[in-house]
Interface confidence: low
């Protein structure tokens, strides 16, 4: 147990933050988006789907140091976190053909990033060892999705591995470990 | 999914103590950094404490430096606030935050979060 920075398969590494993101005001509705007697969702009501420029969906800079073992980058990387609840910034009645309750079945958006960026970092080593280079995907911007079941399942459901995407003139790279997996290896840290 | 639960608020007199502390639990492995934010009754929510989950790097706001300390359990995974010499204005509901961000070396990553929990009212009177 516990969140002691570790590596948790060969290329994703989970660093220490450099700085911290400072989340902005939340909505009127200080309701959580994560507890547990809303399955991950917004409290229910009913809302209109449709017009996703309504919803709330936060970018976040964060700045930090990426880490590959011993070695850390020379210069901390921007990044952006995608924060908030995506759903209206006004209620809308349930008139009868337009409102919709929020229920698992229906409609479901979050805030998840939109558009990535490269960035090529130089990772320093301790004992005298040449500098290494890598190249990170940073998030580059934030939306509001309808969440499809490629997004529930490679990006929303497992924190803990990294969500297995085909690349193109690439073989698809085998999915990393499960998180409960992840979970026993942080256990087993301690 | 990241469970926050917060405990530890109350009414206390100015120049008193408290100690808030917040649980977190789910994908705590994702957590990079937890902090305590404060709303008072008409303003904004603001932030009072960082800390980072493995290293321990803290931060806090101007107001509370020198009287607030924040501390983690990684054993517990907790995060706590001790406040100290509290004062009328700091007064306010105290919020639980964490903070996930994916990835580093390498292509595949997963979104990005911030996850509050429910709450606690913390009342310093004079």
């Known amino acids: 147990q516990g969140w002691q920075a570790f590596k948790n398969d060969a290329t994703e590494i989970i660093p220490e933050l450099g700085e911290y993101p400072e989340p902005p005001p939340e909505l009127e509705n200080n309701k959580t988006m994560n507890r547990a007697e809303n399955g991950g969702r917004p409290p229910h009501h009913p809302f209109e789907t449709k017009d996703v420029s309504e919803y709330s969906c936060r970018e976040l800079h964060f700045t930090r140091y990426v880490t590959d073992g011993p070695c850390r980058s020379a210069k901390p990387v921007t990044e952006l976190v995608c924060s908030g609840q995506c759903g209206p910034a006004r209620l809308l009645p349930n008139a009868i053909g337009r409102g919709k309750w929020w229920r698992p079945s229906g409609p479901d958006f979050r805030c998840i990033p939109d558009r990535y960026r490269a960035q090529r970092v130089q990772l320093l080593c301790p004992g005298g060892e040449a500098p290494r280079a890598r190249k990170v995907r940073l998030v580059a911007s934030c939306k509001c999705k309808r969440l499809t079941r490629f997004h529930n399942q490679s990006e929303l459901k497992d924190f803990g591995t990294e969500a297995a995407r085909p690349q193109k003139g690439r073989k698809p790279r085998p999915r990393a470990r499960s998180a409960k997996a992840n979970q026993a290896e942080l256990e087993n840290a301690y | 999914e990241v469970q926050l639960v917060e405990s530890g608020g109350g009414l206390v007199q100015a120049g008193g103590s408290l100690r808030l502390s917040c649980a977190a639990s789910g994908s705590i492995f994702s957590i990079l950094t937890m902090g305590w934010y404060r709303q008072a009754p008409g303003r904004q929510r603001e932030m009072v404490a960082t800390?980072?989950?493995?290293?321990?790097?803290?931060n806090y706001t101007d107001s509370v430096k020198g009287r607030f300390s924040i501390s983690r359990d990684n054993n517990k995974n907790t995060v706590y606030l001790q406040m100290n010499s509290l004062k009328p204005e700091d007064t306010a509901v105290y919020y639980c935050?964490?903070?996930?961000?994916?990835?580093?070396?390498?292509?595949?990553?997963?979104?990005?979060?911030?996850?509050w929990g429910q709450g606690t009212q913390v009342t310093v009177s004079s």
């Open positions: 935050n964490a903070a996930m961000v994916g990835g580093g070396v390498g292509l595949g990553r997963r979104p990005s979060f911030s996850y």
């Open positions: 800390i980072t989950t493995s290293g321990g790097l803290t």
